[in-house]
């Protein structure tokens, strides 16, 4: 028996369902009573789902997995993983045994889009050209860790004086806080881009500081 899986990782959004595809070619006269199907975590060998003696033995993995019972006899051994979590990420092995056996591994990559960044300025009043200000760009509930880029109004990358921290919450999703420290000019726009490297999703935020609210010192 030859087992086939998709070579590319399966990308699944958090809280959606994912299908880990696995198939085999049944011989003529094949019956499900002959099939021993095991889905397990590749690294730890922990059982995820099994089918033996013509029966679906059910999920051994937080009761969120299911087979496609009507398609098994056709050689479709795919696994449905419901309400995907960050902790589901990793490699899964599909093991099929009839008379002989074969197995193959499929990777699950979990992702969650980042929210539109919120921008804060400190201090946020009595600003004068030449003042040092701190601009914070915050984006929430994404996965995996983000890449953060800062640019000025002319699109010039700002790399100095940037501090970025990423903290995972109880669900494993990241909240990103990136802090840019700059010396104010007469006016300027500062933008941050939070990129999800798996989804290739960009979330943009910007703040524009104009001359209007600024109090210019009197000219000598």
């Amino acid at each position: 028996v030859e087992v086939q899986v998709s070579e590319d990782p399966v990308v699944a959004l958090v809280d959606t369902d994912a299908t880990l595809r696995c198939s085999f070619s049944p011989e003529p006269g094949f019956s499900l009573a002959q099939l021993n199907l095991i889905w397990q975590l590749t690294d730890t060998k922990q059982l995820v789902h099994s089918f033996t003696e013509g029966r679906d033995q059910g999920s051994a993995y937080s009761n969120r997995t299911a087979l496609f019972p009507d398609l098994l006899v056709q050689g479709n051994a795919s696994l449905r993983l419901q309400r995907v979590r960050v902790t589901d990420e990793g490699s899964y092995t599909c093991f099929v045994s009839i008379q002989d056996f074969d197995s193959a591994a499929v990777s699950l990559q979990v992702a969650a889009p980042y929210s539109k960044p919120s921008m804060t300025l400190e201090p946020n009043k009595d600003l004068r050209p030449g003042n040092m200000v701190t601009i914070t760009c915050s984006s929430y509930q994404g996965y995996p860790e983000a890449e953060v880029f800062w640019k000025d109004g002319q699109g010039v990358p700002l790399t100095g004086n940037v501090t970025t921290s990423q903290m995972a919450n109880e669900r494993g999703l990241f909240d990103v806080h990136s802090v840019l420290r700059v010396v104010l000019g007469a006016n300027g726009t500062y933008s941050c881009l939070v990129r999800n490297p798996v989804l290739q999703q960009d979330a943009h935020g910007s703040v524009t500081i104009t001359g209007q609210p600024l109090t210019f010192p009197p000219e000598a």
């Epitope: 095991i38 397990q40 060998k45 059982l47 029966r55 033995q57 999920s59 051994a60 045994s97």
Partner: antibody
Framework: QVKLQQSGADLVKPGASVKLSCKAS????????MHWVKQRPGQGLEWIGM????????NYNEKFKNRATLTVDKSSSTAYMQLNSLTSEDSAVYYC?????????WGQGTTVTVSS | DIVLTQSPASLAVSLGQRATITCSAS?????MHWYQQKSGTSPKRWIY???KLASGVPARFSGSGSGTSYSLTISSMEAEDAATYYC?????????FGAGTKLEIK
């Protein structure tokens, strides 16, 4: 005929580990799930976990997940269970059993006594 | 986890009388298996797939049930039937056993 031969009785100290063996014969070892079951004196049967010798896939009772480790040696058709951090509550008879439409064949059991 | 509740916990039956042990599952299961264990020996598979008798099991034993309610019945109690009987399911993970019913001769 199917036979599961388990290792002899063990006397171990609290906090220590024990590794029990179950040698299978009379059938194709790699084709069947092997289960492990605990029975305290005068008590009922408690499922510990199972292993499939062909894939090494394991499934544990949550109660034993962090202390029990199931392994197999395909070349000798032997299943093993290691139990760590033993306490007096682990004093029991431990059985291995082959799964074929129920646990159709059982080992004779290994008595583990935890005492200082 | 599916909890299997056996009743009664113990049962004394006269020779030749009928004995019934029940096993109630906390959620529906597809099959029930039964094991017999005598003191100082390993359990033996006795009834599998709800109603099939294991090899060597006398025809006076029968099993039935579906969903959440299953039973093992001995039509005419004999001395050799005195033992503890356990029900067990593996329709859903994890596999679970009932607490056992001790069957004695009255």
């Amino acid at each position: 005929q199917v036979k599961l031969q388990q290792s002899g009785a063990d006397l171990v100290k609290p906090g220590a580990s024990v590794k029990l063996s179950c040698k299978a014969s009379g059938y194709t070892f790699t084709s069947y799930w092997m289960h492990w079951v605990k029975q305290r004196p005068g008590q009922g049967l408690e499922w510990i976990g199972m292993i499939h010798p062909n894939s090494d896939g394991t499934n544990y009772n949550e109660k034993f997940k962090n202390r029990a480790t199931l392994t197999v040696d395909k070349s000798s058709s032997t299943a093993y269970m290691q139990l760590n951090s033993l306490t007096s509550e682990d004093s029991a008879v431990y059985y291995c059993a082959r799964w074929s439409y129920g646990m159709d064949s059982w080992g004779q059991g290994t008595t583990v006594t935890v005492s200082s | 986890d599916i909890v299997l509740t056996q009743s009664p916990a113990s049962l004394a039956v006269s020779l030749g009388q009928r004995a019934t042990i029940t096993c109630s599952a906390s959620s529906s299961v597809s099959y029930m298996h039964w094991y017999q264990q005598k003191s100082g020996t390993s359990p033996k598979r006795w009834i599998y797939d709800t109603s099939k008798l294991a090899s060597g099991v006398p025809a006076r034993f029968s099993g039935s049930g579906s969903g959440t309610s299953y039973s093992l019945t001995i039509s005419s109690m004999e001395a050799e039937d005195a033992a503890t009987y356990y029900c067990q399911q593996w329709s859903r993970n994890p596999l679970t056993f009932g607490a056992g019913t001790k069957l004695e001769i009255k």
